[in-house]
């Protein structure tokens, strides 16, 4: 088990490594560089040389006066001041603003829709398998297995509400006890945090942006993992969640409510149901060991059906099974009786793309997975671009101050709790923590929201998603009301307990520190982000699942040494950083281990070797896409990948050596003359650069 990898080469003061930087042009953050195209072109620009040893991201991203890479970038206003505009310019500026707002809302809408379709795609690809996970009898006795099943199923179906509703129906039909369901709910809480981590991966193109976005997304993961790490053993030992929720449920005087509010779904459903509609009951039926459901398709074909109660002739094994003594006969071969059966008549087909294709679920799932990821990625890029152009100068200052500033003393501590309430409220409105946290991720990336502020918003989001579940439980039918309410309350109190553990005392805000650490590593070795995703959401849960199936002795036999090594490494790491003198000289650092066990550098070299051959075609594709993008938006400077690809090609021609994979996406700062993209701004039409 290697210790937490360190950022060996991160430079605290980038200005030391810059030559020829003039006072006329400070090294601005990348965001402002990108949007600075309307500046007066007469400003002298000095080309500076970078000393070769360090990654350009570390040197360029942050301003010279800033030491902390986590400080938000200055989003400079490059537009013409309002007072300097003529009437036509002002009108155009207003229209441009409205246009941007409409575009932003449009892309946000499709972003949310693509998340919904992505969830459907995952259900089509892995839903049936997810259902079969639940029908495993070992869940009852093994809380650890329950936990990983919760994680895996939620990851596979990309929806904690789907996995939770399966659990509810299983508890309601006595296939699962509430005690056995609690670890699954905890696992579902972890699994749901993968969505915004995937969204963060979309911002991999810009190192500093990616550092912030990835840390902002994984703060959710770490909160959930740490909460489970503490609360699962506590729950297994004391059953406090089960006991507390049972007391609450028993104090209720049940009366079936009305349907839970749909809110955001009201807007997105009309569009997403034109793409695909799923029969969610199938997954639940598989989980409840219904053999017939295994052959059913998840893709809904008939949307309008008529259910009629009718007397039907059915075969029975013997006369004893006849519904009534008189209504029984034989045709000489089979014994028949009359039974009241509900007969479902199909009236109208659904109106979605896949209704008449009769493709297997896997095929539909893969098609939707690709499309939804492309739309998600495209929308995210456009949202980031539009926000980047809108959130500058005064607007940026106001927004950043509003979101990130604390209340005046002595009420500063209340700000975070207000953020928790805001997060809960927003999640309740959008009816999905995934949607809220995924929308938050690009804002963290571009520097509008700090990670310190994103953390309570995310915690609030966790609470918000449980209030939705409580409302849905109160609206559920009598047979599932008790179990669904108890499970929803377990989910709620689990998140409340997690907040009490990891938020009130600033010292305990461990998820922030862990997420920042991961953000730093992922910014330097971007492949590590994908590794983290695979390891934490797939490999570890699947390994635990496999070991649990093998039985407790195997799980303990493998688990105890692994946990022991992790604790040993953590203790050693703590002593190394706090009081290294206590340790023998050899243990004061990790150099006694092979390099590959305490640094990602050797691994980076290996991965670069594998990814090297894919860089050229990737870059060619990137350049074509960028040029098209530039033509469409009419902005020749928005596109940075073509330059980096050019450098890559030149480097390869000169040396015949493949360039390291992570550098492919670096933002190389060059003068505008060198780019050959100098153009005088149209003072009349340009409000702020898109």
């Amino acid at each position: 088990m290697a210790p937490w990898p360190e950022l060996g080469d991160a430079q605290p003061n980038p200005s030391k490594y810059l030559e020829g930087a003039t006072s006329q042009q400070p090294i601005t953050p990348d965001k402002s560089k990108e949007t600075n195209k309307t500046d007066n072109t007469e400003v002298p620009v000095t080309k500076f040389e970078l000393l070769p040893t360090y990654s350009t991201a570390t040197l360029i991203e942050e301003p010279t006066e800033v030491d902390d890479p986590w400080n938000l970038p200055t989003l400079q206003d490059s537009g013409i001041k309002w007072s300097e505009r003529d009437a036509k310019g002002k009108i155009l500026c207003v229209f441009q603003g409205i246009g941007r707002l409409i575009l932003l809302l449009g892309f946000l809408y499709f972003f949310v829709c693509s998340l919904d379709v992505l969830s459907s795609a995952f259900q089509l690809v892995g839903g049936k398998m997810a259902g079969q996970f639940f029908s495993n009898s070992s869940i009852m006795s093994n809380p650890l297995l329950g936990l990983v099943i919760g994680v895996l199923v939620t990851v596979f179906v990309q929806s904690s509400s789907t996995s939770t509703s399966i659990v509810v129906s299983m508890v309601a039909s006595s296939l699962l006890t509430v005690r056995a369901a609690i670890p699954i709910i905890m696992g579902a809480n972890i699994g749901t945090s993968i969505t915004n981590t995937i969204v963060a991966l979309m911002q991999v193109g810009d190192r500093s942006e990616f550092r912030r976005a990835f840390a902002g997304a994984t703060v959710h993961d770490f909160f959930n993992w740490l909460s489970v790490l503490v609360l699962l053993p506590v729950e297994v030992a004391t059953h406090y969640l089960e006991v507390v929720t049972q007391l609450i449920v028993e104090s209720f005087h049940f009366k079936n409510g009305e349907d839970a509010p749909d809110l955001l779904k009201v807007i997105t459903k009309p569009f997403t149901k034109l793409i695909v509609q799923l029969d969610k009951k199938v997954i639940s039926q598989i989980a409840m060991n219904d053999e017939t459901a295994k052959n059913k398709s998840l893709v809904k074909i008939w949307c309008k059906t008529f259910t009629n109660m009718t007397q039907m002739n059915v075969t029975v094994p013997s006369m004893a099974n006849c519904t009534s003594h008189s209504l029984c006969w034989t045709d000489g071969i089979q014994i028949w009786t009359m039974k009241n059966v509900t007969y479902k008549e199909n009236i109208a087909k659904c109106q979605h793309i896949f209704v008449n294709f009769h493709l297997p679920d896997l095929a539909v799932g893969i098609i939707l997975l690709i499309i939804s990821l492309l739309v998600l990625c495209g929308c995210l890029i456009m949202i980031v671009k539009i926000l980047g152009s809108v959130l500058k100068g005064q607007v940026a200052t106001v927004i950043k101050k509003t979101i990130n500033t604390d209340f005046p003393f002595p009420f500063a501590w209340l700000t975070g709790y207000l953020a928790i309430l805001v997060g809960a409220g927003m999640t309740f409105i959008v009816q999905s923590s995934s949607v809220f946290t995924s929308a938050l991720t690009p804002l963290i990336g571009i520097g509008v929201i700090t990670i310190e502020r994103a953390y309570p918003l995310t915690l609030g989001s966790n609470i918000g998603t449980t209030t939705t579940a409580i409302l849905a439980a109160l609206a559920s039918p009598g047979n599932t009301l008790r179990s669904s309410l108890q499970i929803a309350l377990c989910h709620f109190f689990f998140n409340i307990s997690g907040i009490l553990l990891w938020y009130p005392i600033p010292f305990t805000r461990l998820p922030i520190r862990m997420a920042k650490g991961l953000g730093n590593i992922s910014a330097k070795y971007r492949w590590f982000a994908v590794f983290y995703l695979i390891i934490f959401f797939f490999l570890i849960p699947l390994t635990v699942f496999g070991l649990s199936l093998a039985g407790w002795p195997v799980l303990v036999g493998v688990g105890v040494p692994v946990v022991f090594i992790i604790i040993l490494v953590l203790c050693l790491r703590l002593l190394q950083s706090r009081c290294p003198r206590v340790l023998p000289k050899k243990l004061q650092n990790w150099n006694f281990l092979p390099l590959c066990m305490h640094s990602l550098k050797p691994w980076d070299a290996v991965i670069s070797k594998f990814t090297g051959p894919f860089q050229m075609p990737c870059c060619c594709c990137c350049r074509v896409c960028c040029r098209v993008c530039c033509l469409l938006c009419g902005c020749p400077k928005c596109c940075r990948c073509s330059k980096c690809c050019q450098d890559l090609e030149e480097g390869q021609e000169a040396q015949g050596v493949p360039v390291k994979a992570p550098e492919t996406f670096d933002n190389i700062t060059i003068s505008r003359e060198a780019q050959g993209e100098v153009r005088a701004p149209d003072s009349k039409t340009e409000c702020t650069a898109l």
Epitope: N313, W329, I333
Partner: antibody
């Protein structure tokens, strides 16, 4: 219209076997059960057995088991009854009749009958 | 096996008369009884099923009744074309069994 047309009369020696066919038309063969009933001269009706052509499930009266085989050919909508180890008491008119599957309407259509004479 | 006994074994009647044929099952058969008509030299024809339901195309003068063990077939007004042998059949349990038949003649 509904028709069940049986093969012609047969004269057989004791110990031999006879195969009677029943070609159907005018209805969905697989939706019905085909029964075989015999009538000895001057006697009542005796049920032999039945077959569901859709899945080839059969049932026979106890005293015919092992001697009778009912088959059905879906492609030609034809049912067959083979009776082996013939005895003189097997001399009778053999009828095929249809019975609507999953329905209690009994044998609503009959073939014209096939006379089987067993004599040495 | 369920035994089905029919009475009378034969009867002679006049055109326009009312005729009743009875059928008794050895055990309760509910309403799983059918009546067939077999004219001389012809194959049987279904008249009544489920004890009282008239088959398609069967004249209204034929009515069936009864449940449990006792069943009757009534011809309200005998016509010359009704000269035939009438069989009752139970289909409550396998094997399917028939009555010996009632021969109806016109004087």
């Amino acid at each position: 219209q509904v028709q069940l047309v049986q093969s012609g009369a047969e004269v057989k020696k004791p110990g031999s076997s006879v195969k009677v066919s029943c070609k159907t038309s005018g209805f969905f063969f697989t939706e019905y059960i085909i029964h075989w009933v015999r009538q000895a001269p001057g006697q009542g009706l005796e049920w032999i057995g039945g077959i569901i052509p859709n899945n080839d499930v059969t049932n026979y009266k106890q005293n015919f088991r092992g001697r009778v085989t009912l088959t059905a050919d879906k492609s030609t909508s034809t049912a067959y009854m083979e009776l082996s180890s013939l005895r003189s008491e097997d001399t009778a008119v053999y009828y095929c009749a249809r019975w609507r599957n999953a329905y209690y309407s009994a044998m609503d259509s009959w073939g014209q009958g096939t006379t089987v004479t067993v004599s040495s | 096996d369920i035994q089905v006994t029919q009475s009378p074994s034969s009867l002679s009647t006049s055109v326009g008369d009312r005729v009743t044929i009875t059928c008794t099952a050895s055990q309760d058969v509910g309403t799983a009884v059918a009546w067939y008509q077999q004219k001389p030299g012809k194959s049987p024809k279904l008249l009544i099923y489920w004890a009282s339901t008239r088959h398609t195309g069967v004249p209204e003068r034929f009515t069936g009744s009864g449940s449990g063990t006792d069943f009757t077939l009534t011809i309200s007004s005998v016509q010359p074309e009704d000269v035939a042998t009438y069989f009752c059949q139970q289909y409550r349990t396998s094997p399917l069994t028939f009555g010996v038949g009632t021969k109806v003649e016109i004087k």
